[in-house]
Interface confidence: low
């Protein structure tokens, strides 16, 4: 994988340990937490970032909960079970053995209960909706131009195909990005959607991931795209399951 | 500037095949789906179908299916067509075209200027 | 296929009369409506896409309207510039079909 040779780094993933004891003394790249070796060719999973950000822990934050069947990321950061592939498990638990399921973006998908708790496989999140409010400009942006910018955005920077930025919605001043990505679509050495929205979620924040690299500077021809605030709605391929205690 | 340049029209002769070339620039056609529509000498448009520049991913129109193939040369931002059993019928300008990837991009904002083909004997 | 269906087929109007075409969708389409129009001797040109987003650099006189399966194309203010076939077109789903096209002369 390419970590930058001449210093040692991982250029896509700040949050590793870094050291050239790699096949032919190439530098090798861990994820902190985990100690999972890392491509950093590409975009780090959720799992293995949430894992390392535990390790270093902030104040959790809450979002706004949305209805019907999308999920929104409610229970804040927790520190979760990865497995070897660095994908969330499908059963996450807490020290104080309390349990629950997630689907592939970690994303809390049933009500909690105890070590009996069954989740059977992880679910695919297949449809994530990023909306977000730009500050005041001086007038509305160009919807040509604001879609061709968040298209190369994720292009260039999260490395995701265009294919699977499905939408960019704009009714001044909200902003929706709609990503969808099935099972069936995503091929091997293709970024997942959950991570490509993690990276983005963390760079509109002013926290990115990326090492060394300056924030993210959106613009949209020249004139500066400042997010006042995201909410982020995932929709799996399986609705989730919760007691109608919760849906009231 | 924005183009798209199509080449490799001519008369051919019935039974024959043609293979087009759209030359694409000034725009990274990573990000696009690149189609050929044509157009039947005063009649409408009609799409034929698409590739994806990045992993050659190919939707053809079911009327061409088994006669149509789409290829791309990244090294050379170009796509090609390759039409075979040709009839009178497809006598027509043939246009490249790019669209955006979610089908809420799935229209055409830059076209090339047509390569016209002719089959007749 | 979804058939796209425009009306008129042609039609006739002086400088700065208000135009109306129509396209009507063999099924809900959604707001995946564009319009073209294509001049004598060129290729086609984007004015409208996603019903009613009008495209860099198109006049404000080009609006477009509709949901589902009515979509509607209106020139306020008709120019010389504007004859030529406009044509409508679903991008909903693939086969990606357009209407027969309306022809607009100029009195």
């Known amino acids: 994988h390419t970590a930058a040779q001449d210093n040692c780094t991982c250029p896509t993933n700040k949050m590793t340990v870094c050291s050239p004891d790699g096949p032919g003394g190439r530098c090798q790249c861990r994820a902190l937490g985990s100690g999972m070796a890392v491509d950093c060719s590409t975009l780090t999973s959720k799992c293995l970032l949430l894992k390392a950000r535990m390790s270093a822990p902030k104040n959790a934050r809450t979002l706004v909960r949305p209805s019907e069947h999308a999920l929104v990321d409610n229970d804040g950061l927790y520190d979760p079970d990865c497995d070897p592939e660095g994908r969330f498990k499908a059963r996450q638990c807490n020290q104080t053995s309390v349990c629950w399921c997630v689907n592939s973006v970690g994303v809390r998908r049933t009500d909690k209960g105890d070590l009996s708790l069954r989740c059977d496989e992880l679910v695919r999140t297949h449809h994530i909706l990023i909306d977000l409010r730009h500050r005041p400009t001086a007038g509305a942006f160009n919807h040509s131009d604001l879609d061709a910018e968040l298209r190369r955005l994720f292009r260039e920077r999260y490395r995701l195909h265009p294919k699977f930025v499905a939408a960019v919605h704009y009714e001044q001043p909200t902003i929706q990005i709609e990503l969808r990505q099935n099972t069936s679509q995503k091929a091997a050495g293709d970024v997942d959607i959950g991570d490509a929205a993690y990276y983005f979620e963390r760079d509109i924040k002013g926290e990115s991931l990326f090492q060394g690299r300056g924030g993210l500077d959106l613009r949209v021809r020249g004139e500066p795209l400042q997010v006042e605030r995201t909410l982020i709605y995932y929709l799996d391929e399986i609705p989730p399951k919760f007691s109608m205690k919760r849906l009231t | 500037e924005v183009q798209l340049v199509e080449s490799g029209g001519g008369l051919i002769q019935p039974g024959g095949s043609l293979k087009l070339s759209c030359a694409a620039s000034?725009?990274?056609?990573?990000?696009?789906?690149m189609n050929w529509v044509r157009q039947a000498p005063g009649k409408g448009l009609e799409w034929m179908g698409r590739?994806?520049?990045?992993?050659?991913?190919?939707h053809y129109n079911q009327k061409f299916k088994d006669r149509v193939t789409m290829t791309r040369d990244t090294s050379t931002s170009t796509v090609y067509m390759e039409l075979s059993s040709l009839r009178s019928e497809d006598t027509a300008v043939y246009y490249c075209?790019?669209?955006?990837?979610?089908?809420?991009?799935?229209?055409?904002?830059?076209w090339g200027q047509g390569t016209t083909v002719t089959v007749s004997s | 296929a979804i058939r796209m269906t425009q009306s008129p087929f042609s039609l006739s109007a002086s400088v700065g009369d208000r135009v109306t075409i129509t396209c009507k969708a063999s099924q809900d389409v959604s707001t995946a409506v564009a319009w073209y129009l294509q001049k004598p001797g060129q290729s086609p040109q984007l004015l409208i896409y996603s019903a009613s987003y009008r495209y860099t650099g198109v006049p404000d006189r080009f609006s477009g309207s509709g949901s589902g399966t009515d979509f509607t194309l209106k020139i306020s203010r008709v120019e010389a510039e504007d004859v030529g076939v406009y044509y409508c077109q679903q991008h909903y789903s693939t086969p990606l079909t357009f209407g027969q096209g309306t022809r607009l002369e100029i009195k």
């Open positions: 000034g725009f990274t056609v990573s990000n696009y789906w």
């Open positions: 075209a790019r669209s955006g990837f979610g089908s809420t991009y799935w229209f055409f904002d830059v």
């Open positions: 590739i994806d520049p990045n992993d050659s991913e190919t």
